[in-house]
């Protein structure tokens, strides 16, 4: 049963297609695992910022630094990859920034194209020149984490020399990694010394040791993989957004919606009404109406403008979005002033970050 | 694990009406669409409509309006798509699937038979 | 409602062919197509959505690409166990609309 009487159909979809839509998008910012970021939080005149990742608050810890306006990540990881907001709290306003981290390896996803130089790293030695196991290119070796999207291949190397010309191995979790341990099972490329995986699912996560050893010596060198998942996802709007505003009669108003969404998205702008004087329906759902939506008449879909407003203006107003997958939903009041009651100027609008198309 | 799992095989007769239930586990039933899709013997796929949980937002093919309704009980996590005026032609598997397509149901045979 | 036409209807390829079957939207959809393989008697299962993100856990030989009105799916080295039908399918605006489909079969 909807939640809601309508006064306007608001379905999940408009009878017309929308219009093809920008949608606004996060600055991103890549940092390869083991890497340290640091991020300024782009708002000016901030009095208190806090900082949130997925929509959780964020605090310092041992990794996360935070100081003034910068935050700081030591030893990225790719459980740090998510989406990151900075509020700056003002006495009258607050105000938040979106960024994107992405903490990836992209080296680990279908390299095979650098297998050419493999050759370089099988060492043959001179036969009186006895040797237990070295590192020939550590360089190939210096990401440990990677994160890598399901269904890539990833590749492992530990080129390596010594003589007699060592064999490799490759532990899972620290056991014998078999075969039958993975559908599709691996490949060893001795001659290269990497161990291949091909469409990584996430029960391929955990540690990957390459063990090299002759009658001389061992030596070992671990690796983290992560697989990071790709489903369809909802739409998200900027928290914080769209904020609440207050005009004098006669004044004009702007209400923001920040919506991220990989598929279309159909925006709404929804208020409460009255209908014959009352503001809920026999079924005591209230009463909406629909005041805008993204479709073929319709301008920039996240931005409600309102001009010259009445008391009867007044209430809240919902910026509701929906794609294929789902819906979301955020809603800011207004609060509409008689002139003798001006606050400081005629007109006030939104303090909502830029919008950005 | 996510499952979609539906009511059984009906058979039906011509001007009747036919409701499909859709039970799922595994995620948050209220935060995703449910679609319902429909195929034909040897034919091809025909989206009919979806509902929003949450809120009991409904959108529908025009070709299915006023003889589609979808509906969604939130405490059981089941959705559910009527049919009525039934006839020959609505014989067809009928397939729930999780709001990115991304999870169906087994399916529902529909049987429109005199 | 938007139309997509997808083509071939049907198809035969060897073991190890590359094949690819492409879609067109009768209106510009963006990137907001998705790709299902359907075999005898069971649901459709989601391959590609966004026209070319691979859903978690589809094989990487499996890809898809375009913009706009024109779309393509491609299989880049054909395995037995892909012998089913391939659909594409309009997430831009309902009615959400499919190809007809497109049977595909080993030499």
């Known amino acids: 049963r909807p939640s809601f009487s309508l006064v306007e159909d608001t379905t999940l979809e408009p009878e017309e297609p929308p219009t093809k839509y920008q949608i606004s998008q996060p600055e991103v910012y890549v940092a390869a695992p083991g890497e340290s970021l640091e991020v300024r939080c782009l708002l000016k005149d901030a009095a208190v910022i806090s900082w949130t990742k997925d929509g959780v608050h964020l605090g310092p810890n041992n990794r996360t630094v935070l100081i003034g306006e910068y935050l700081q990540i030591k030893g990225a990881t790719p459980r740090d990859s998510g989406l990151y907001a900075c509020t700056a709290s003002r006495t009258v306003d607050s105000e938040t920034w979106y960024f994107m981290v992405n903490v990836t390896d992209a080296i680990s996803s279908g390299d095979d194209e650098d297998d050419t130089d493999g050759a370089e790293d099988f060492v043959s030695e001179n036969s009186n020149n006895k040797r237990a196991p070295y590192w020939t290119n550590t360089e190939k070796m210096e990401k440990r984490l990677h994160a890598v999207p399901a269904a890539n291949t990833v590749k492992f190397r530990c080129p390596a020399g010594g003589n007699p010309m060592p064999t490799m191995r490759w532990l899972k979790n620290g056991k014998e990694f078999k075969q039958e341990h993975r559908i599709g099972g691996y490949k060893v490329r001795n001659q290269h010394w990497s161990l291949i995986m091909e469409s990584v699912v996430p029960s391929d996560k955990g540690n990957y040791t390459c063990v090299v050893e002759n009658e001389y010596g061992s030596i070992n060198h671990t690796y983290h993989l992560d697989v990071v998942e790709r489903s369809p996802h909802r739409p998200i709007l900027q928290a914080g957004l769209p904020a609440n505003a207050s005009t004098v009669v006669g004044g004009d108003v702007e209400f923001v919606c920040k919506v991220y969404s990989d598929a279309q998205p159909h925006i709404q702008w929804i208020k409460h009404v009255e209908k014959n004087g009352s503001k809920y329906g026999p079924d005591g759902l209230p009463y909406l109406k629909v005041l805008k939506h993204s479709g073929i008449n319709s301008s920039n879909a996240e931005v409600l403008a309102l001009f010259n407003v009445t008391e009867a203006d007044a209430g809240e107003y919902i910026c509701k979005v929906s794609n294929y997958i789902g819906q979301a939903n955020q809603s800011a009041w207004l609060t509409v002033l008689p002139k003798q009651q001006a606050p400081g100027r005629e007109k006030e609008i939104t303090a909502s970050p830029d919008y950005l198309e | 694990q996510v499952q979609l799992v539906q009511s059984g095989a009906e058979v039906k007769k011509p001007g009747s009406s036919v409701k499909v239930s859709c039970k799922a586990s595994g995620y948050t039933f209220t935060s995703y669409n449910m679609h319902w899709v429909r195929q034909a013997p040897g034919q091809g796929l025909e989206w009919i409509g979806a509902?929003?949980?949450?809120?009991?937002?409904?959108s529908y093919n025009q070709k299915f309006k006023g003889r589609a309704t979808i509906t969604a009980d939130k405490s059981t996590s089941t959705a559910y798509m009527e049919l009525s005026s039934l006839r020959s032609e609505d014989t067809a598997v009928y397939y729930c699937?999780?709001?990115?397509?991304?999870?169906w149901g087994q399916g529902t045979t529909v049987t429109v038979s005199s | 409602d938007i139309q997509m036409t997808q083509s071939p209807s049907s198809l035969s390829a060897s073991v190890g062919d590359r094949v690819t079957i492409t879609c067109k939207a009768s209106?510009?959809?963006?990137?907001?197509v998705a790709w299902y393989q359907q075999k005898p008697g069971k649901a459709p299962k989601l391959l590609i959505f966004s026209a070319s993100y691979r859903y978690t856990g589809v094989p990487s030989r499996f890809s898809g690409s375009g913009s706009g009105t024109d779309f393509t799916f491609t299989i880049s080295s054909l395995q037995p166990e892909d012998i089913a039908t391939y659909y594409c399918q309009q997430h831009y605006s309902s009615p959400y609309t499919f190809g007809q489909g497109t049977k595909l079969e080993i030499k």
């Open positions: 209106q510009d959809v963006s990137t907001n």
């Open positions: 509902i929003f949980p949450e809120n009991g937002d409904t």
């Open positions: 699937a999780r709001g990115g397509f991304d999870y």
